[in-house]
């Protein structure tokens, strides 16, 4: 009796965070024995899509010509061989940006900060939202999710950073979202350049909880430290 079929690999091109209206291709790679590939979306009432394999049969393409809210969500894929269906792939989370108007990102007291001092990045939305995300360019993960308690909605979230080191320097954007779908984000805020000056270089701040990533050390997510933000949002690590 052979063991279960190995799970396929699932990925998205050009990536898993897609702007509304843009195209995205989801790939599922299995084995050369695959006869059919199936893409399932979490909590969908039926298989999301089914495709015949592309030669040499070890992968299939699932095309989304225009990204909309319908396609945002968590996917897994399977392949069928003569002995049955494979194990599911690891999940792929497809996120759509552009679902809501863009928030405003600012730095308090200033985007020019001396090393060793404190700075707070403030993400403000025009309408009340319950989740805010801070992104740093070229970071492997969102830096921080802030989600409100009990579904209470807020117009802003504060991301305090202290003490600031040169590693905090760079370009930041933020997004806002509603809790009913973590896969629908606002348009990104305009970029904010955080410039760290001075020679008060201390040790790199250690995350309050690490996030594993295959990226190099400069791509590690920066986890701002400090107290619970004044906005009433609590930290929520994904």
């Amino acid at each position: 009796q052979a063991g279960p079929l190995p799970k396929p690999t699932l990925w998205a091109e050009p990536g898993s965070v897609i702007s509304w209206g843009n195209s995205v291709t989801i790939w599922c790679q299995g084995t050369l024995e695959a006869r059919e590939y199936r893409l399932d979306k979490e909590e969908s009432p039926a298989p999301w899509d089914r495709q015949n394999p592309l030669e040499p049969k070890n992968k299939a393409r699932f095309s989304i010509p225009s990204m909309t809210e319908d396609y945002a969500g968590r996917y897994r894929c399977y392949y069928r061989s003569p002995v049955g269906w494979s194990q599911p792939s690891d999940p792929l989370e497809l996120v759509m940006t552009g679902a809501y108007s863009k928030p405003t990102l600012s730095a308090l007291p200033s985007p020019l900060v001396t090393s060793g001092k404190s700075v707070t990045l403030l993400c403000q939305s025009r309408s009340p939202m319950d989740t805010f995300l801070l992104i740093k360019e070229r970071a492997a993960h969102p830096l921080l999710h802030l989600r409100s308690e009990h579904g209470a909605q807020q117009h802003q979230a504060e991301f305090p950073m202290s003490p600031v080191t040169s590693v905090h320097g760079g370009t930041y954007r933020c997004f806002s979202s509603h809790g009913f779908s973590h896969y629908l984000l606002s348009h990104p805020s305009d970029p904010l350049e955080l410039i760290v000056s001075g020679s008060l270089e201390g040790p790199r701040p250690s995350p309050t909880r690490s996030v594993s990533t295959a990226a190099g050390p400069e791509d590690q997510p920066l986890m701002p430290t400090g107290s619970v933000p004044h906005s009433g949002l609590r930290r929520h690590w994904e």
Epitope: A46, P47, E69, S181
Partner: antibody
Framework: QVQLVESGGGVVQPGRSLRLSCAAS????????MHWVRQAPGKGLEWMAG????????YYIDSVKGRFTISRDNSKNTLYLQMNNLRAEDTAVYYC???????????????WGQGTLVTVSS | DAVVTQESALTTSPGETVTLTCRSS?????????ANWVQEKPDHLFTGLIG???NRAPGVPARFSGSLIGDKAALTITGAQTEDEAIYFC?????????FGGGTKLTVLG
């Protein structure tokens, strides 16, 4: 053309069992999910159960979980609904309906059978 | 349990545009409810019109379209025809089961 023909209905006493069948033709049955939907006299539609194309996933409405079982035999192009411990409130016309190949292709409940009447009465 | 509510009856005239709606007791209808619309003609003839990812079933005229309007699902018939007189049911998906609405009886006054 697509055809769905239900059978197996009739008059049955409360607590007894019945098995409904739905014979499919005119399409590749093994590619499609299927549903059972019922309509009590003078009432609206009530979805009962659904099954994926290959039988891997089955869904039920809470009121029939543990009493009703949906199944299929793709080699016979037939859908089944095994109904146990029947109650008076299960009296209805039972329809089978075709589901989609996949969510991005097709419309759930696109084709329906003519229905089979189940009467639960002592 | 979720309850799906539709208008019990609507009346329109040939050539007019009419919108039928479908409300969920659990809150706003979203794309995750995969709103589905089924037409019932006399003698219990049921036909699926629109569903999945807003697909229109083959043979269903283009005058039928589905959408989300505010917190409800909607079926719009643009330029109603007398043959569109029927009962229309919506069905919403709730993670692991479907729930049908009570149906809207649409009358098209000839």
């Amino acid at each position: 053309q697509v055809q769905l023909v239900e059978s197996g209905g009739g008059v049955v006493q409360p607590g007894r069992s019945l098995r409904l069948s739905c014979a499919a033709s005119g399409f590749t049955f093994s590619n499609y999910g299927m549903h059972w939907v019922r309509q009590a006299p003078g009432k609206g539609l009530e979805w009962m159960a659904g099954i994926w194309f290959d039988g891997t996933n089955k869904y039920y409405i809470d009121s029939v979980k543990g009493r009703f079982t949906i199944s299929r035999d793709n080699s016979k192009n037939t859908l089944y609904l095994q109904m146990n411990n029947l109650r008076a409130e299960d009296t209805a016309v039972y329809y089978c309906a075709r589901d989609v190949i996949s969510m991005v292709r097709g419309v759930p409940f696109d084709y329906w059978g003519q229905g089979t009447l189940v009467t639960v009465s002592s | 349990d979720a309850v799906v509510t539709q208008e019990s009856a609507l009346t329109t005239s040939p050539g007019e545009t009419v919108t039928l709606t479908c409300r969920s007791s659990t809150g706003a209808v979203t794309t995750s409810n995969y709103a589905n619309w089924v037409q019932e003609k006399p003698d219990h003839l049921f036909t699926g019109l629109i569903g999945g990812i807003n697909n229109r079933a083959p043979g269903v005229p283009a005058r039928f379209s589905g959408s989300l309007i505010g917190d409800k699902a909607a079926l719009t018939i643009t330029g109603a025809q007398t043959e569109d007189e029927a009962i229309y049911f919506c069905a919403l998906w709730y993670s692991n089961h479907w729930v049908f609405g009570g149906g809207t009886k649409l009358t098209v006054l000839g």
